[in-house]
Interface confidence: low
Amino acid sequence: SDKLYQRKEPVISSVHTKVKGIAEVTENVTEGGVTKLGHSIFDTADYTFPLQGNSFFVMTNYVKSEGQVQTLCPEYPRRGAQCSSDRRCKKGWMDPQSKGIQTGRCVPYDKTRKTCEVSAWCPTEEEKEAPRPALLRSAENFTVLIKNNIHFPGHNYTTRNILPTMNGSCTFHKTWDPQCSIFRLGDIFQEAGENFTEVAVQGGIMGIEIYWDCNLDSWSHHCRPRYSFRRLDDKNMDESFVPGYNFRYAKYYKENNVEKRTLIKAFGIRFDILVFGTGGKF
Amino acid sequence: SDKLYQRKEPVISSVHTKVKGIAEVTENVTEGGVTKLGHSIFDTADYTFPLQGNSFFVMTNYVKSEGQVQTLCPEYPRRGAQCSSDRRCKKGWMDPQSKGIQTGRCVPYDKTRKTCEVSAWCPTEEEKEAPRPALLRSAENFTVLIKNNIHFPGHNYTTRNILPTMNGSCTFHKTWDPQCSIFRLGDIFQEAGENFTEVAVQGGIMGIEIYWDCNLDSWSHHCRPRYSFRRLDDKNMDESFVPGYNFRYAKYYKENNVEKRTLIKAFGIRFDILVFGTGGKF
Amino acid sequence: SDKLYQRKEPVISSVHTKVKGIAEVTENVTEGGVTKLGHSIFDTADYTFPLQGNSFFVMTNYVKSEGQVQTLCPEYPRRGAQCSSDRRCKKGWMDPQSKGIQTGRCVPYDKTRKTCEVSAWCPTEEEKEAPRPALLRSAENFTVLIKNNIHFPGHNYTTRNILPTMNGSCTFHKTWDPQCSIFRLGDIFQEAGENFTEVAVQGGIMGIEIYWDCNLDSWSHHCRPRYSFRRLDDKNMDESFVPGYNFRYAKYYKENNVEKRTLIKAFGIRFDILVFGTGGKF
């Protein structure tokens, strides 16, 4: 609460996160024209990335385009992209939705459809829906340990959210254990009134707010964090503004001296840890 | 404007960016001693990296050192690095400018020059100028969508820069469309009074400032962002302080059971999104 | 110092870092059952990662698990993980400490010990201590150049920590050169009262605080940074809260058409650059 006689100072903060959990993923895998069910295990090195500071990312879904090579090929026949003659294709044109540069030729995409030929990583990425349910939907049971060190330089005061008395096998609960800094991802979503299973399909951004309201006067000293959670991306966002949260990355390799790549479109939850608050002292 | 009767609170912010665009790169490629013109296509997975939060990076230029292997070789004969006898070479010495550890021997670099032998990734990186014009100079036409969610926790108020009424095919313009949050990279530079083509060669840092001056009183409510742009790196910086913006990263692979790497010195623009402002309420 | 008549404004900051240095690493390498001493050179592309903004990471130690493949294998026999019969193993169970999903079978790990079989990246990571002394302990002699651009938008004032008069071959010293922005990593630790060699084993987080106390009135103008250093991770942290600083990442490759990976557990120092302060003007 506001104590008007106090000198207030904003918090300086540093955050360190550690995600734990394993996901079993079952998906259709096509090899040599034969489709079969594949099982694989994803651990932290597979679904998260070495990130700095106030954010961490957990991949919950993905679409792979394997064995792409730089050459010419028909672009993906998304809505409005089909052609019937070369007139429809403009040499050198880069459609922002497309994945390449048009050569000016209209070529067969498959037996029934023709699209503009592009110079690109081929075959071009199929614009298919993200798998539903999400491949790593079991990430709901992953946990994250959040370590937060704070400093009020003007008051020369430092503390952290993890105290020596804390138990490393706890799990945060708003009522039963509000000071535990190990959070189950599904619980974070539940607290924010969101459905993990649903968000995991397209991805999203979740805020973990850590509020420090510190009274640093010796006679009524109090300085512990309060955690709250809210969704940061707009779930009602128009398609044109790219709903959810995803990014593409590539794994490059050589085969028969040809540079190839596997393109991964990774959907997932980016967790932003937003630390704020003040330290007040007479 | 300052309303002294209001309680002011700093903004808590989360940012999400999405870059779009394709670049065609034409460069000399040497294979088996023969140099010829190579064309390649770069899409987002090739020129940008999965980044968190308030920064994104667009590669605009690069220098590759292919097929490096850990062994002994002469260091690159940059200014002051040549030798005529072993006396000039100090075993175990690591020159900060060099890329390896000296063995103590002075060996031929080419037909006319000798340099100190080093234990390093060999052949060592040639210290050549960044290509001019920049290889991905067409990145000027890339666009970035910036999503910004803000929160004034004390006032329990949340909003975002993208409104449901907005059009996903807009492009930001200071006069005609100052609320559009899709920015053409070249326009950002123009607004900041900088030349994209020039900066793309060595790289640089560009600030996108988002200022929220929010009046949260119901009778005169206003809370929309104002965008401005300024260059953050020092274009007049002395050579010794590393002008521009670049970093090195490596792609590792095995060939005939030997661990090799391709070293990429990536030049580019790092865009920092700096969100600030206050929310005031009676 | 506080000038009550001034209008104070918090700093808006952008940071760019550049690490320099080479490490020679000597470690036991096992190939075809034969263990021999291997020497390798690590340069910036090997021990640091392309990072944004206010953090940079320097790897000081690592543990590798090479040639992992997705299959079934016995889990690592850490404390409490051994079994004598299938009853001890629960099909579908994921122990947060384990690296896979139990099949329900108890199988031999080696000649003397049995553990629960798991579906995982196999062979599973051995939970061995981080090498002591740290493999890249010579990182103590690496240097980092820190460029900091600051802005007080309300006062329309911009400056940076590097001035044209500065010498690019300086090294920061609290007394002799407190304005030099090139820091030896070992000196940062010394200033913070910490032992680099010790922290390098398990990793840690080090704060570099840059404090700008700016008087922007023309008659007594002053605006230069003050640097200070403090350790941000808790060195006395209980084992259950993951002391130090490490993360796992993987290098994926194909061998005889089988997807494999090398898992690297990287220990190191994350440096957080914490910029704060105010600009005051009448």
Epitope: Q70, T103 | H39 | -
Partner: nanobody, 122 residues
Framework: EVQLVESGGGLVQAGGSLRLSCVVS??????MGWFRQAPGKEREFVAT????????YYGDSVKGRFTIFRDNAKNTVYLQMNSLKPEDTAVYYC?????????????????WGQGTQVTVSS
């Protein structure tokens, strides 16, 4: 060293067929093309094929009669020539391009074979 070696040329009567082959060693190209040069004339584009075998393109004079296809595993490109006419008489060159654009232009083809003679008699 990069080598392109053509074979399969010869003498054939009008209306007949021939199949030309071009084996590439030392490099893999994004686009492989065939060009031809008749006596006293400029070199003319015949056909090209990308990495994807469906991805082929033909000069106007040979459309519907010639088929280009590529066996990536063997690093070989073929030109099947049916319904041959006397005006198809020329030296046929195989060419490789690292470029992905403008593959009908001989300027983007960096590597060439020695050529194989095709003669169509009436």
């Amino acid at each position: 060293e990069v080598q392109l070696v053509e074979s399969g040329g010869g003498l054939v009567q009008a209306g007949g067929s021939l199949r030309l082959s071009c084996v590439v060693s030392g490099r893999t190209f994004s686009a492989m093309g065939w060009f031809r040069q008749a006596p006293g004339k400029e070199r003319e584009f015949v056909a090209t094929v990308g990495w994807n075998p469906m991805n082929s393109y033909y000069g106007d004079s040979v459309k519907g009669r010639f088929t280009i296809f590529r066996d990536n595993a063997k690093n070989t490109v073929y030109l099947q020539m049916n319904s041959l006419k006397p005006e198809d008489t020329a030296v046929y060159y195989c060419a490789g391009s690292g470029s992905l654009l403008d593959v009908t232009s001989e300027a983007v083809y960096t590597d060439w074979g020695q050529g194989t003679q095709v003669t169509v008699s009436s």
